[in-house]
């Protein structure tokens, strides 16, 4: 192990830290309206928050880097909140043979962690 | 597909968007130097740099999620720069037997992306 | 909250046509696609077909390919379906139900509407 | 088209019995099963979505697992209430079907 341990308890407030939020999205926001039917309103979970040092550190590099922002905060950037997991979901699509059912498998996180 | 294709050329100029840099940091700077034992200076890849739209993205949602932050910037985030693989590296360690070789598969970034 | 109101029951005589309604509210009638499911008596669920109310494309089961037609009213937020050259064995209760969602969940269902088919 | 196979086609319990019931799927379809429950003279009601998710205000004593090809809807104390049919239904792809139907009984 790397003998530093990611923290879960936010030290910046409560919904502060790298947390995930839905979002809510129509096709038209996201471009897709001409070839994505339905639905057409999207329940989109995100990423967003801070990630303060060692919170929810995703691995070793994840630790190290948040290690040597404190040291070099000009030249190693801090972690960020970024998807760990996705959930699935479908959409219905415009075809040229018509209308088909297709799975997005990295449309909508499920997790958060700071990489 | 998602439609909104992932772009590799940097609009920001060179070395502005996300990309892999070499940052040198001691045994000392990681707070390791009491139980690894070798190298004392290790060469970490790390990803930094700027996301902008559609630069490197991971995935369908880090598109979607720079489309959004176009539209609602405060309330989501843009893609930032995280490592998209790794590269393992070896380090001496100091165990209660005496010294040891162990493997770290996620301390050194290999590849970036914006997540 | 989210309902789905069916019209009445119909009685026909075979080869004539019926026409069934479901009308939305509680949610806006055009962010999601209606499907139509029967179901004859004493018998399991069938998938008719599917209509997105925004935009009017349509998939119908292939059985049914030519003798249905599925319509929507965006004004009224209403959905229709009407089935042609009635056979007796279309009879049967029809149910609209609102889904896929992004989740493939069809979580809504009318009422249903008894459709007899007899000479 | 896809057949959704379900067994057993009825099964015969008591109150607070736990209760399976299983469907494949001829192909995978990923997790895109759902369950409902239908009592006589009335409309399916959904129970589980994307094969575990429990529909809002369905009781926890429901749970649904399985992907791929073979899944499980479990009722673990069944009630007097619970007394229906069950059916499964993939939407991995058009046409959507439907499995036969379970009829759960009283003992």
């Known amino acids: 192990s790397a003998h530093l341990h990611p923290r879960d308890s936010c030290p910046l407030g409560p919904g502060r830290c790298c947390h995930l939020e839905t979002v809510q999205a129509t096709l038209e926001d996201l471009g897709w309206s001409d070839w994505v039917l339905s639905p057409r309103q999207l329940q989109l979970s995100m990423c967003v928050g801070e990630c303060p040092h060692l919170y929810r550190s995703a691995n070793t590099h994840a630790l190290i880097k948040a290690r040597l922002h404190g040291l070099q905060p000009d030249r190693v950037p801090a972690p960020c909140c970024v998807p760990s997991s996705y959930t699935p979901v479908v959409l219905m699509h415009r075809t040229d043979s018509g209308v088909s059912l297709q799975t997005y498998d990295d449309l909508v996180a499920q997790g958060c962690h700071c990489a | 597909s998602a439609h909104l294709h992932p772009r590799d050329s940097c609009p920001l100029g060179p070395g502005r968007c996300c990309h892999l840099e070499t940052v040198q940091a001691t045994l000392e700077d990681l707070g390791w130097s009491d139980w690894v034992l070798s190298p004392r200076q290790l060469q970490l890849s790390m990803c930094v740099g700027e996301c902008p739209h559609l630069y490197r993205s991971a995935n369908t949602h880090a598109l979607i999620k720079a489309r959004l932050h176009g539209l609602q910037p405060d309330r989501v985030p843009a893609p930032c720069c995280v490592p998209s693989s790794y590269t393992p590296v070896v380090l001496m360690h100091r165990t209660d037997s005496g010294v040891s070789l162990q493997t770290y598969d996620d301390l050194v970034a290999q590849g970036c992306h914006c997540a | 909250q989210v309902q789905l109101v069916q019209s009445g029951a119909e009685v026909k005589k075979p080869g004539a046509s019926v026409k069934v309604s479901c009308k939305a509210s509680?949610?806006?009638?055009?962010?999601?696609?209606i499907n139509w499911v029967r179901q004859a008596p004493g018998q399991g669920l069938e998938w008719m077909g599917w209509i997105t109310a925004y935009s009017g494309d349509t998939v119908y089961a292939q059985k049914l390919q030519g003798r249905v037609t599925m319509t929507t009213d965006t004004s009224t937020s209403t959905a229709y379906m009407e089935l042609r050259s009635l056979r007796s064995d279309d009879t049967a209760v029809y149910y609209c139900?609102?889904?896929?969602?992004?989740?493939?969940?069809?979580?809504?269902w009318g009422q249903g509407t008894m459709v007899t088919v007899s000479s | 088209d896809i057949q959704m196979t379900q067994s057993p086609s009825s099964v015969s319990a008591s109150v607070g019995d736990r209760v399976t019931i299983t469907c494949r799927a001829s192909?995978?379809?990923?997790?895109?099963l759902a369950w409902y429950q239908q009592k006589p003279g009335k409309a399916p009601k959904l129970l589980i979505y994307a094969a575990s998710s429990l529909q809002s205000g369905v009781p926890s004593r429901f749970s649904g697992s399985g992907s791929g090809t073979d899944f499980t809807l479990t009722i673990s104390s069944l009630q007097p209430e619970d007394f229906a049919t069950y059916y499964c239904?993939?939407?991995?792809?058009?046409?959507?079907?439907f499995g036969g139907g379970t009829k759960v009984e009283i003992k």
């Open positions: 192909q995978g379809i990923s997790s895109w």
């Open positions: 139900a609102r889904g896929p969602g992004q989740y493939a969940d069809v979580d809504v």
């Open positions: 509680g949610y806006t009638f055009t962010d999601e696609g």
């Open positions: 239904q993939q939407a991995n792809s058009f046409p959507i079907t």
